[in-house]
């Protein structure tokens, strides 16, 4: 229509951290060159003081040297470290260059700080000089405090680095640096490349998601390149050696560190925080610079890295709104079948239990309020004289009364008893005269047996029952509220296995059941449990939601039923219900 906004044509960007149904899924930051534009600390740069350097080229058997001046004070003649990580234009190469002839045992180091943990895929260097004869790449995982080798290059691995030459990589040593003589040729004299791929040849690379060893192996906060030995033509010790020595130096046009900001599958981007530090923009209820822990109150299961198959999002503790803190208990998690390990701390509103799910001693449940209500637990108020203790029945609130005492709080004498002055036996039997009148009839509540058969909970499900009903859904009862002659249950519809004319959608809905049906346990239903509900279409009091009654089947959910119900669903689509 004419009132459309100017942005109407722009579709909202899909959220990489959740699927089209809003369920969490693994997400990872973009692949970047983490070195681009970053400062590199180098141990040597030519030009301070200005110095001659000579570039060697070859024409057939002839070696030609053209000499230039490196001057750090002259931008046109300087070769600073910034040239390592600037925009690499092949038509206008800018090269960092070391001082001349820093030959073994002296080395030259380049140190790049990435600012946070990255998962590094490759480290590459493009040379303006010949490639080094020996060179090592190191990584730090603790912001430069300690260093471990990543890769060695040398024509003499044993002599230079005390490593075997091209050692085979096995599952047992896949997190160890190897030494190779590839990429160590002196030629080309300019433009040569050294590229180290962190996962190349590592046996578990194909199953990276399930290899903590390799996940650790590719993780780095800093990268260091150490040039150990220059390639020479062997003329550096001849009479006219000064010219030769001025021809030997390290020069690099481009340093790249390809990889992704490490967020363990729980963030799609990294951002700058208030301290200007690079951190993951964590999702899935995770926290920390690498989304490497669960955010407060989301400790119902252990933190885990996301995988292609599972988002492994952190789950909030279930404390029924009565606690602000919880902690994770691994053993309870395992005992629950690896479902829930959160233990609520300091339950408030007179609740108790691991999930603040029952009332503490001296209190009982007000069944008219959901367990999440602030006043779900009422004080027992047991009479100090009439009651035998302070703890009442958790559901009815009935206090334990002394002999001859009655009332929910044990505050009066029972029929046939009279008050005494003793606090030990506050009610004593009235001496009984022989009976003269017929016992007055007490009106019984309506007999549930004649109204309906209360379900025993051991019901079987079969195709016939499935076909008879208009709808079949898996529900999770969240809370219950009394509404006149009805009970209104707030339920989460987890799966829909059958639906009639009224379209049932997944998500939170109302389930209406008449109070009389609930009183007679037809159906028997409890909050916080999961059920399979099979029922018939009927108008609900609020024209939305679904209705269940004494003819509905409500059975406590079992995970094994999912497959069976999907089969029934397929059979129904093929018209099998008509035959049944």
């Amino acid at each position: 229509g004419p009132g459309l906004s100017m942005f109407a044509g722009q579709a909202a960007q899909p959220d990489p951290c959740s699927d089209e149904n809003g369920h969490p899924r693994r997400c990872i930051p973009d692949f970047v060159n983490a070195a681009f534009g970053k400062d590199v600390r180098v141990s040597s740069t030519c030009g301070r003081p200005p110095a001659r350097y000579c570039v060697v080229s070859e024409r057939g058997e002839e070696r030609l040297r053209s000499c230039h001046l490196c001057n750090a004070s002259d931008p046109k003649k300087a070769h600073p470290p910034a040239f390592l990580t600037d925009l690499n234009n092949p038509h206008n190469l800018t090269c960092w260059q070391s001082e001349n002839y820093l030959q073994f045992p002296h080395n030259v180091t380049l140190t790049l700080s990435l600012g946070k943990k990255f998962e590094v895929t490759y480290v590459s260097l493009q040379f303006c000089s010949p490639r080094p004869e020996s060179m090592a790449i190191y990584k730090s995982m603790d912001y430069g405090r300690t260093w471990v080798p990543f890769q060695f290059y040398s024509t003499q691995c044993r002599k230079m680095y005390n490593r075997p030459h091209r050692a085979p990589i096995t599952k047992q040593n896949e997190q160890e640096a190897v030494c190779t003589d590839s990429h160590t040729d002196m030629r080309p004299l300019s433009g040569g490349l050294i590229a180290f791929s962190t996962l190349d040849g590592r046996p578990s690379a194909h199953d990276f998601d399930n290899s903590p060893v390799l996940q650790d192996w590719v993780t780095a906060t800093d990268i260091r390149v150490a040039f150990s030995r220059l390639h020479t033509f062997g003329d550096e010790n001849e009479d006219d050696s000064e010219l030769a020595r001025d021809s030997y130096f390290y020069a690099v046009s481009d340093l790249q560190v390809g990889g992704r900001c490490k967020c363990n599958g729980h963030a799609a981007r990294c951002v700058r925080d208030r301290d200007d530090s690079l951190v993951c923009d964590c999702r899935h209820n995770t926290a920390g610079p690498e989304c490497d822990r669960c955010k407060p109150f989301h400790y119902d299961r252990p933190w885990q890295r996301a995988t292609a198959r599972e988002a492994n999002e952190c789950v909030a503790c279930n404390c029924n709104l009565h606690a602000r803190r919880c902690r994770f208990n691994m053993e309870l998690y395992k005992l629950s079948g690896r479902k829930s390990g959160g233990v609520c701390l300091n339950c408030r509103h007179n609740t108790a239990g691991r999930h603040c799910h029952y009332c503490k001693e001296g209190y009982y449940r007000d069944m008219g309020k959901p367990i999440t209500h602030r006043k779900a637990c009422k004080a027992c108020d047991c009479h100090p004289v009439g009651a035998a203790g302070k703890t009442c029945n958790q559901t009815t609130g009935q206090c334990p009364c002394k002999d001859g005492v009655t009332g929910i709080t044990c505050n009066r004498c029972a029929k046939g008893y009279q008050q005494s002055r003793s606090p030990i036996a506050p009610c004593i039997k009235i001496p009984v005269a022989p009976p003269t009148t017929a016992a007055s009839s007490v009106e019984e509540p309506e007999d549930c047996d004649s109204y309906c058969k209360a379900s025993k909970g051991k019901l079987k499900i079969n195709m016939k029952k499935y076909c008879k009903k208009d709808y079949a859904v898996q529900i999770h009862i969240l809370k219950a509220d009394k509404a006149g002659d009805w009970w209104k249950f707030t339920v989460n519809i987890i799966s829909v296995y059958k639906q009639g004319t009224s379209r049932i959608r997944r998500g939170d809905q109302s389930l209406w059941i008449r109070s009389r049906d609930i009183a007679c346990k037809c159906p028997k239903i409890k909050p916080l449990k999961k059920y399979l509900l099979l029922g018939n279409a009927e108008d609900s009091p609020d024209q939305s939601g679904i209705v269940a009654d004494k003819s509905s089947l409500v059975i406590q959910w079992r995970d094994t039923w999912a497959r069976r119900l999907r089969k029934f669903q397929q059979r129904e689509k093929k018209g099998k219900c008509k035959k049944a």
């Epitope: 208990n329 053993e331 309870l332 395992k334 005992l335 629950s336 079948g337 690896r338 233990v343 108790a352 239990g353 691991r354």
Partner: antibody
Framework: QAYLQQSGAELVRPGASVKMSCKAS????????MHWVKQTPRQGLEWIGA????????SYNQKFKGKATLTVDKSSSTAYMQLSSLTSEDSAVYFC?????????WGQGTLVTVSA | SIVMTQTPKFLLVSAGDRVTITCKAS??????VAWYQQKPGQSPKLLIY???NRYTGVPDRFTGSGYGTDFTFTISTVQAEDLAVYFC?????????FGGGTKLEIK
């Protein structure tokens, strides 16, 4: 140092019940699960179940549901296990063990003999 | 429930020998495996937890390894006091289960 002291040996008639105790000391009783393990020469070690004294939550091996009932008394730092409807199959040594990372602390065991 | 199959049932060795006991889980239990030693008339004693971690005070001749379904317990140099029954146990998923035990006897 954690220590678990179990009650003495029991000789009981078939069909009867028995309740044994495990008194804990040297650690925060409410912070660790208390597990119960049965040992017989024929079946070896079998895990019966566990109770979390912090709130009384229990977890049972399906095989022992209805046979064993686990309870605690926080005030005395004592865990209890009641075995009901005893038969000769229930004759065994029963251990309590503190949970955590593996069962690092065990009681000395209670021998139960079921005999007519 | 997860079945822990322990082999061998009996081991007759001399002091100084190297001993290896294996435990196979019927499904993956990650590294949630412990090993216990039980001497005659005593309660079991924890030696190894999380498959390869030696418990406090346990001599370094006792080692454990494995992940998933296959686990190994090794005594590098058997001593006379190592005469006992050794059990593996998984606590990955309830119900916790034990291996059948390996009785170690010294010649």
């Amino acid at each position: 140092q954690a220590y678990l002291q179990q009650s003495g040996a029991e000789l009981v008639r078939p069909g009867a019940s028995v309740k044994m105790s495990c008194k804990a000391s040297g650690y925060t009783f409410t912070s660790y699960n208390m597990h119960w393990v049965k040992q017989t020469p024929r079946q070896g070690l079998e895990w019966i179940g566990a109770i979390y004294p912090g709130n009384g939550d229990t977890s049972y091996n399906q095989k022992f549901k209805g046979k064993a009932t686990l309870t605690v008394d926080k005030s005395s730092s004592t865990a209890y296990m009641q075995l009901s409807s005893l038969t000769s199959e229930d004759s065994a040594v029963y251990f309590c063990a503190r949970g955590g990372t593996g069962f690092a602390y065990w009681g000395q065991g209670t021998l139960v003999t079921v005999s007519a | 429930s997860i079945v822990m199959t322990q082999t061998p049932k009996f081991l007759l060795v001399s002091a100084g020998d190297r001993v290896t006991i294996t435990c196979k889980a019927s499904q993956s239990v990650s590294n949630d495996v412990a090993w216990y030693q039980q001497k005659p008339g005593q309660s079991p004693k924890l030696l190894i937890y999380y498959a390869s971690n030696r418990y406090t005070g346990v001599p370094d001749r006792f080692t454990g390894s494995g992940y998933g379904t296959d686990f190994t317990f090794t005594i590098s140099t058997v001593q006379a006091e190592d005469l006992a029954v050794y059990f593996c146990q998984q606590d990955y998923s309830s119900p916790w289960t034990f291996g059948g035990g390996t009785k170690l006897e010294i010649k």
